[in-house]
Interface confidence: low
């Protein structure tokens, strides 16, 4: 009956709308319902327009072009033509009243069967039942395995392949280790497997920035270093660096009213020129403080250098040397004044003598036939130099002297002119200011070194060279090189250093040959008011520690190897450094920080005087050490 109705409708459509033109009302009579009419009529008008204009474009946007108006109009009511369903996913299409119904194949869904069902995402069958990889395909899916696995016969489960058994030479010289789905070629720590050469190669950890500052790679490992000269030490993680911290604060207060005489290792600290009436005579008054035994306090001379006067210290006593056209004299006298106390000193030219007083008591009177400095053109012109000579004058002196003097002067009055502008000059320059309180000893500020050239060879000794060292130390920082021997090839065949211990608030003393620690004296509380004493002897056969302390040492066999390295170095040229190292590579020693604190050194029975050093950093104090900072109620 339904098909009969369709045929009738088709006949009416032919008659009403193809053989003749129909309006929408006439079309409504054909279809007898609004939905089909509303669907049909706009498309009918498109067919008419296309054929009337002769420029036919498919009325239903189909890929099939209709040959004539009849075909175009007849196709309008069939909802399944052209096919609205997805060809891949549909099973059938059913025409309806201005609608259609697509029936989908298994694995497809949607009004037009346009959507693939993802079986791999089915919550009722997780991962499509696959044990590893589920691959969704249009309208279906299949299981697969990861690399290193094979599919079982059930097409769903996977099994691991043992590559190491399949190919025994898979890893070459490395060890093959099977792991799920793969294999690993294992190398010892510090080595990495090279696929091309099938071998283990050293890892350059340094190129991977393992260290915070400096890194040295070696086969199978690496070592981190920190720049001790910039005040860093290696942290406990052996990678990062931390600042070397103060363990014993010192009183570094200075006063500009106190002139420091050792500001320069070599050279004048202050130079003054006087132009006074010819009746003036030389005079100098000042307070003086030192622990040094020898050096120049002041040197005065005439403009033409022909006459001069030297006020110095020798053996702790005041020495005066003078020379002019009339006479040449040297006198030493008075009490020892290198006692660290302030002593008032005055030197005054009288009519027939030069009077030297200490604490206002005359200690020397030097006769002179005429004026010390000869006036010219009605003026007495005099140049005065503190703590040094203006040029090489050794040959002119009556008795040579080491000019370097670690001391301070205050309350000076030269040529009866008072302080006359000198204080203003000194006030500007911090390094000319003296410490308010000092003790006996030498002070290393942690910023420089002193160099000595010492002959360690003892001709009468069958052992050849020997080093006997006594150190008296009061460190202010817990890490630093105290004593080092450096070869001409920039190696450090012997060093004695301080390092902060792993145990809190204590220090270790390490003795090293090149970069190997041969002795470690553990956990000493060295950062205290008390000075610590360390004594040892070294020769080519032995290192003997004379201070009874807890020692950690390398094996005797290894010690002999290291002493052989030292012996070889000692047969060449070595320089001795106190307070740190010169420019050697960071990896040359286990410690490279400068020593900070007080220290006296005796080598082979000789107390080293820093005034006698080949070179010395200006900030090292040869004969004065800052006091320990004392906490006051206000601080």
């Amino acid at each position: 009956a339904n098909s009969m109705l369709e045929e009738t409708k088709q006949g009416n459509l032919e008659r009403e709308c193809i053989e003749e033109l129909c309006n929408k009302e006439e079309a409504r009579e054909v279809f007898e319902n609004d939905p089909e009419t509303d669907y049909f009529y706009p498309k009918y008008l498109v067919c008419l327009r296309s054929f009337q204009s002769g420029l036919f474009t498919a009325a239903r946007q189909s890929t099939d072009a209709y040959p004539d108006l009849r075909s175009c109009v007849n196709a309008i009511p069939d909802q399944c033509s052209p096919l609205p369903c997805n060809e891949d996913g549909y099973m059938s299409c059913k025409d309806g009243k201005a609608s259609f119904t697509c029936t989908c194949k298994p694995g497809w869904q949607g009004e037009k069967c346009e959507f693939d069902i993802n079986e791999c995402k089915d919550p009722s069958n997780i991962n499509g039942g696959c044990s590893q990889i589920c691959d969704n395909t249009p309208g279906s899916y299949h299981c697969s395995c990861k690399s290193g696995f094979v599919m079982l016969s059930n097409k769903k489960d996977c099994k691991d392949v043992d590559e190491c058994s399949l190919k025994p030479n898979m890893c070459g010289t490395a060890v093959c280790k099977n792991i799920p789905g793969d294999f690993e070629c294992e190398c010892p720590e510090g080595y990495r497997y090279n696929l091309k050469s099938k071998s283990c190669e050293d890892v350059d950890e340094c190129s991977e920035n393992m260290c915070a500052q400096l890194c040295v790679n070696y086969p199978g490992g690496y070592t981190c270093y920190c720049d001790g000269k910039k005040g860093f030490k290696l942290a406990q993680d052996q990678k990062s660096c931390e600042a070397v911290s103060v363990c014993l604060p010192l009183n570094l207060d200075t006063k500009y009213e106190l002139l420091y005489l050792a500001e320069q290792f070599a050279g004048v600290v202050l130079y003054l020129k006087f132009r006074l009436p010819e009746i003036s005579r030389f005079s100098a008054e000042f307070d003086f403080r030192t622990y040094d035994s020898q050096g120049v306090i002041l040197y005065a001379e005439s403009i033409d250098h022909s006459a001069w006067l030297l006020i110095a210290l020798r053996g702790g006593k005041i020495e005066v040397q003078l020379k002019n056209e009339h006479t040449s004299k040297i006198t030493t006298g008075g009490d020892i004044i290198n006692n660290g106390l302030w002593n008032m000193v005055s030197v005054e030219e009288l009519e027939h003598s030069i009077s030297i007083k200490i604490a206002k008591e005359a200690v020397m009177d030097i006769n002179k036939p005429g004026p010390l400095f000869k006036p010219e053109n009605g003026l007495l012109e005099t140049k005065v130099y503190f703590a040094g000579f203006p040029r090489k004058v050794e040959s002119e002196l009556i008795k040579p002297i080491n000019p370097r003097l670690d001391g301070c002067i205050r309350s000076w009055n030269l040529m009866k002119q008072g302080a006359s502008g000198i204080k203003e000059i000194i006030q500007e320059k911090q390094n000319k200011h003296c410490l308010v309180t000092v003790e006996k000893g030498s002070y290393y500020p942690g910023s420089g070194i002193a160099e000595f050239h010492i002959d360690y060879n003892n001709g009468s000794n069958a052992e050849g060279w020997h080093i006997n060292v006594t150190l008296n130390i009061r460190p202010s920082m817990g890490t630093g090189v105290m004593l080092a021997l450096v070869s001409s090839n920039n190696t450090v065949p012997f060093a004695v250093s301080l390092v902060d211990s792993t145990s809190e608030k204590s220090q270790d003393i390490v003795i090293s040959v090149e970069n190997t620690v041969i002795y470690r004296i553990q956990a000493l509380s060295l950062c205290s008011n008390q000075r610590s004493h360390l004594e040892f002897r070294v020769n080519r056969n032995n290192l003997e520690l004379l201070t009874p302390l807890k020692i950690e040492t390398i094996s005797q066999e290894e010690l002999q190897t290291q002493l052989a390295i030292l012996d070889k170095a000692m047969k060449g040229k070595v320089a001795t450094y106190l307070g740190g190292l010169p420019d050697v590579p960071f990896s040359a020693t286990p410690v490279n920080a400068f020593y900070n604190g007080c220290m006296e050194v005796n080598i082979n029975g000789v107390e080293l005087d820093l005034d006698e050093a080949i070179s010395k950093h200006n900030d090292i104090r040869a004969h004065s050490c800052p006091s320990v900072w004392k906490k006051t109620k206000n601080s």
Partner: antibody, heavy 122, light 108 residues
């Protein structure tokens, strides 16, 4: 990726001051594990390291002895840059100037600026 | 200062051949404080090797370095056309950090 971009004049008169700037991207001038350097290259002297600046809880500089008396290298932290000042230049200072990063505390140079040809001439 | 001497001054080879460049220091630069650079015309030097033997990031494995103390070698196992340019060594064991005078690698 670290990049260094140089800027500054290509012509300087004798006795005047040569000034160049190096802008850093991809790293910080205050990086505790880097050093920022200036290197120059001329046919007569080849490649020559001039100096560097680096930060290790405070700023440090180190300079080659050959130019120490007339060189200043400064960090400009606000702009993530560093600069070179070379005073009292002579025609001998004519060269291509490069800025470069020193890796960690090492002084090998893993990143370089594009180079600036500076001619000293009146 | 440490003086680095590179040899030969110029090396003429063909693509595919092996190149061996030498760098000698006037005194020890420490075990491995030596770097190698490649410089193409109009460009800044490019780091190839640091620590005497450690290849820098992105450097092909045909480049390798060896040596310690005072004698160092850069080897290019199979020369590619782009490898024909100038190579410098540099020591960073002690300040001032110095460079060699360079070796020019040219096509035979």
């Amino acid at each position: 990726q670290v990049q260094l971009q140089q800027s500054g004049p290509g012509l300087v008169k004798p006795s005047q001051t040569l000034s160049l700037t190096c802008a850093i991207s991809g790293d910080s001038v205050s990086n505790n594990n880097a050093a920022w350097n200036w290197i120059r290259q001329s046919p007569s002297r080849g490649l020559e390291w001039l100096g560097g600046t680096y930060y290790r809880s405070k700023w440090y500089n180190d300079y080659a002895v050959s130019v120490k008396s007339r060189i200043i290298i400064n960090p400009v932290t606000s702009k993530n840059q560093f600069s070179l000042q070379l005073n009292s230049v002579t025609p001998e200072d004519t060269a291509v100037y490069y800025c470069a990063r020193g890796s960690s505390w090492y002084r090998f140079f893993d990143y370089w600026g594009q180079g600036t040809l500076v001619t000293v001439s009146s | 200062e440490i003086v680095l001497t590179q040899s030969p001054g110029t090396l003429s080879l063909s693509p595919g051949e092996r190149a061996t460049l030498s760098c000698r220091a006037s005194q020890s630069v420490g075990s491995s404080y030596l770097a190698w650079y490649q410089q193409k015309p109009g460009q800044a030097p490019r780091l190839l090797i640091s620590g005497a033997s450690g290849r820098a990031t992105g450097i092909p494995d045909r480049f390798s370095g060896s040596g310690s103390g005072t004698d160092f070698t850069l080897t290019i196992s199979r020369l590619e056309p782009e490898d024909f340019t100038v190579y410098y060594c540099q020591q960073y064991g002690s300040s001032p950090y110095t460079f060699g005078q360079g070796t020019k690698l040219e096509i035979k």
